[in-house]
Interface confidence: medium
């Protein structure tokens, strides 16, 4: 088992919204749960966009999940990852609001 590296980034979009993206990379096996939490609970699936789980060329895999949030509300959101019995929560980095 190779645990994922998780990275959360923000990109600015229009009208006071930003897109937050949670990327998991370099993990094996390929089964992984990656989802955004708002206020401590999962966002509905129709507000999130997932990338395919793809090989990264090193015998491991990568994927991502993204959602659009209101600028200034970053503190309410975390990315949750579960892989091979290990798990963690990853906040949106500060200083983006």
């Amino acid at each position: 088992t190779v645990p994922p590296m998780v990275n959360v980034t923000c990109s600015e979009v229009s009208e006071g919204n930003i897109t937050v993206t949670c990327r998991a990379s370099s993990f094996y096996p390929r089964n992984i749960t990656l989802t955004w939490r708002q206020d401590g609970v999962s966002l509905s699936h129709n507000t999130q966009q997932w990338g395919d789980v793809l090989p990264d060329g090193n015998g491991t895999y990568q994927t991502w999940v993204a959602t659009r949030i209101r600028q200034g509300e970053e503190q309410r959101f975390t990315c949750y990852m579960e892989h091979s019995g290990n798990h963690g929560t990853h906040p949106v980095p500060s200083g983006n609001s």
């Epitope: 749960t33 989802t35 206020d39 401590g40 609970v41 999962s42 509905s44 509300e73 503190q75 309410r76 579960e82 019995g85 798990h87």
Partner: antibody, heavy 119, light 107 residues
Framework: DVQLQGSGPGLVKPSQSLSLTCSVT???????YYWNWIRQFPGNKLEWM?????????NYNPSLKNRISITRDTSKNQFFLKLSSVTTEDTATYYC???DGRGAWFAYWAQGTLVTVSA | DIQMTQSPASLSASVGETVTITCRAS??????LAWYQQKQGKSPQLLVY???TLADGVPSRFSGSGSGTQYSLKINSLQPEDFGNYYC?????????FGAGTKVEIK
């Protein structure tokens, strides 16, 4: 360390409103976290009622329809529960509790406040 | 709403025994599960969150497991202070809901 303390009348008449206060010490309720009310009925069933967040937004249990309101007084570092049109079915022990944005599990609870609805 | 079904409703065990409490969700809650212990006249206390993570200060004889809709709390080598009621709670979606509880009595 953060401490929560619930208070309010122990007896409320049917059709009236139930009002409870949660006083928080050791942490500002506007800084972070989610400030909740949970009740436990006779027989021990637990029901999440709703929260007010650090930013002032609310989320309520739909089972309480339009009877519930959770507000706050930031100057006193308190938040409040108001439940209107109570019946004997609202007799319960009421807890205030906190969770954080990592996940909605309750790591901090006040002692319970028993509220009896009776004529 | 996600409904949480706990079993058994009560159990009685001797000190040193291992006991297991189960919680079934009406839908997949993806490990978004917490367990609490409550003693008579006291507030619930967090034991486990994210299905498997022990809260601070919780003895290692407690462990959580499960996935999907089926979860368990195991207490190894039951101690006298472990008596009380145990509750599961999901946080996959709103409204947050709890199981009806399991009463653990010491023989």
């Amino acid at each position: 360390d953060v401490q929560l303390q619930g208070s309010g009348p122990g007896l409320v008449k049917p059709s009236q409103s139930l009002s409870l206060t949660c006083s928080v010490t050791g942490y500002s309720i506007t800084n972070d976290y989610y400030w909740n009310w949970i009740r436990q009925f006779p027989g021990n069933k637990l029901e999440w009622m709703g929260f007010i967040s650090f930013g002032g937004s609310n989320n309520y249990n739909p089972s309480l329809k339009n009877r519930i309101s959770i507000t706050r007084d930031t100057s006193k570092n308190q938040f409040f529960l108001k439940l209107s049109s109570v019946t004997t079915e609202d007799t319960a022990t009421y807890y205030c509790a906190r969770y954080d944005g990592r996940g909605a599990w309750f790591a901090y609870w006040a002692q319970g406040t028993l509220v009896t609805v009776s004529a | 709403d996600i409904q949480m079904t706990q079993s058994p409703a009560s159990l009685s065990a001797s000190v040193g025994e291992t006991v297991t409490i189960t919680c079934r969700a009406s839908g997949n809650i993806h490990n978004y599960l917490a367990w609490y212990q409550q003693k008579q006249g006291k507030s619930p206390q967090l034991l486990v969150y994210d299905a498997i993570t022990l809260a601070d200060g919780v003895p290692s004889r407690f462990s959580g497991s499960g996935s999907g809709t089926q979860y368990s709390l195991k207490i190894n080598s039951l101690q006298p202070e472990d008596f009380g009621n145990y509750y599961c709670q999901h946080f996959w979606s709103f409204p947050l809901t709890f199981g009806a509880g399991t009463k653990v009595e010491i023989k």
